[in-house]
Amino acid sequence: KAMHVAQPAVVLANSRGTASFVCEYASPGKATEVRVTVLRQADSQVTEVCAATYMMGNELTFLDDSICTGTSSGNQVNLTIQGLRAMDTGLYICKVELMYPPPYYMGIGNGTQIYVIDPEPCPDSD
């Protein structure tokens, strides 16, 4: 079953290559287990950036080597992606799945265009 998902259209990563955005979903029922996936679309290719499954009221748990962190509050998730470089500029899509209890719902946002600008190297100070 389909579900509405909203996210910002554009986000600019900071000088340390970190970008944060909110992913909000219209929960149609009492889900207790939710899965959030961040997908990156660039040059018509879609790749998974990170994913986390969480129980309502608990923290999101990404894999230890994940570049993502996040927190949840109700039906919104605050996502942070770290270690971004200019080459990582692209459309980052939030996918939300209500895993339990049935029925299963899935929604995909329109994507957040994340712009990453590599910082200029500091000039040598002689």
Epitope: A6, A26, S27, P28, G29, T32, G74, N75, Q76
Partner: nanobody, 126 residues
Amino acid sequence: QVQLVESGGGLVQPGGSLRLSCASSGDTLESFAVGWFRQAPGKEREELACIGRTGEFTDYPGSVKGRFTITRDNAKNTVYLEMVNLKAEDTGVYYCAAERLVFHLCSLSEYDYDTWGQGTQVTVSS
């Protein structure tokens, strides 16, 4: 801090109609999605309708779709639930709840709401 107060409940005959109001006596409601729920004696709390911050997004479970309509007037800091063709099984205590969100969506899950009113009794009986 929003504080919610429901009103408009009462005794109504089967087939009749009622309009419930949910007003905030604290913060402005325009930053909050609002949901209506009811609890019948001896039953779990049931979702009825929700409306996003701007009013453009609404959602209903199949059980009340077509009979219940949720609207909001942000200028009056109030959300309304219009109920028509009421049945005996609509009897219960009706609660509104609020959740601060970033975008325009809303949730039908009671788990997502952190601020609740005290409720207003609706009795459908001849």
